[in-house]
Interface confidence: low
Amino acid sequence: TPEVWVQVRMEATELSSFTIRCGFLGSGSISLVTVSWGGPNGAGGTTLAVLHPERGIRQWAPARQARWETQSSISLILEGSGASSPCANTTFCCKFASFPEGSWEACGSLPPSSDPGLSAPPTPAPILRAD
């Protein structure tokens, strides 16, 4: 079954900056990726970026740079400042839509024991939504 992985890293050089990387392990082509924080989009989360393979990328503060890393993975840099600054226990979620194969969403946050600039390798996260 396809899975989504989420990796969150705090930048060593800027402690208020985060890098979120998400990947889709399925075989289908991706039609839309939505990145949110504070929980899943639609369940209290706030959308940070939407990436469409043909129509481009849209992002909202404090997202600084969203981009495709591969055909099935994306990265997003967050630059915290003031009220919109992420904190260490912020939850970030990525939803990959690959209809009709399905839509999959997974969430992650900074590992509690992580030092700035360090992170665990990406690991598959639970499938939260599928069709």
Partner: antibody, heavy 115, light 107 residues
Framework: EVQLQESGGGSVKPGGSLQLSCAAS????????MSWIRQSPEKKLEWVAE????????YYPDTVTGRFTISRDNAKNTLYLEMSSLRSEDTAMYYC????????WGQGTLVTVSA | DVVMTQSHKFVSTSVGGRVSITCKAS??????VAWYQQKPGQSPKLLIY???YRFTGVPDRFTGSGSGTDFTLTINGVQAEDLAVYSC?????????FGGGTKLEIK
Amino acid sequence: EVQLQESGGGSVKPGGSLQLSCAASGFTFSSYGMSWIRQSPEKKLEWVAEISSGGTYTYYPDTVTGRFTISRDNAKNTLYLEMSSLRSEDTAMYYCARGDPFGYWGQGTLVTVSA
Amino acid sequence: DVVMTQSHKFVSTSVGGRVSITCKASQDVMTAVAWYQQKPGQSPKLLIYSTSYRFTGVPDRFTGSGSGTDFTLTINGVQAEDLAVYSCQQHYSTPRTFGGGTKLEIK
């Protein structure tokens, strides 16, 4: 063949409660997100709840948040919608549906809220 | 919330004709729009998803197009069994929202 069969509809007074069920067959229920959608007497469609495949996450529009609760029992291949503090505007045909967008729909169960 | 507007409540054509049903989103939803068909006394059925992709078993006379805020469902070679209400829905953001529906009448 994908089949979805709703039950539990009926008449209830304003402020009352009702639980709808949706029995699923013909596919691996635990692998799919599921939703409830309703259709008013004026035939307007409104999505009212969604639950993730494992039941971890639930989603609602503002119109039903705090009054409706979606849940599922993957061992029984059954989806539920618990409705409380019902209002006259909740009168509708309630459908369960698979996926996002909604690839398969049940035949619906009618809920009537009236004094 | 994204408001989906179908400005025409009714459209009419003859058997064998061609008809276009339009839908407008209140904001850019990229290509995340689906179309449903609901025949009298039946539940809705998914025809098109992601603007232009036909769902399983949908005849190729049904075609979807558009992007951003303006979307169209076109039925070529309309058949008598196509008599139904057609509704659009955005699957871009939560809450998922539907248009009010357009009824296809056969002359």
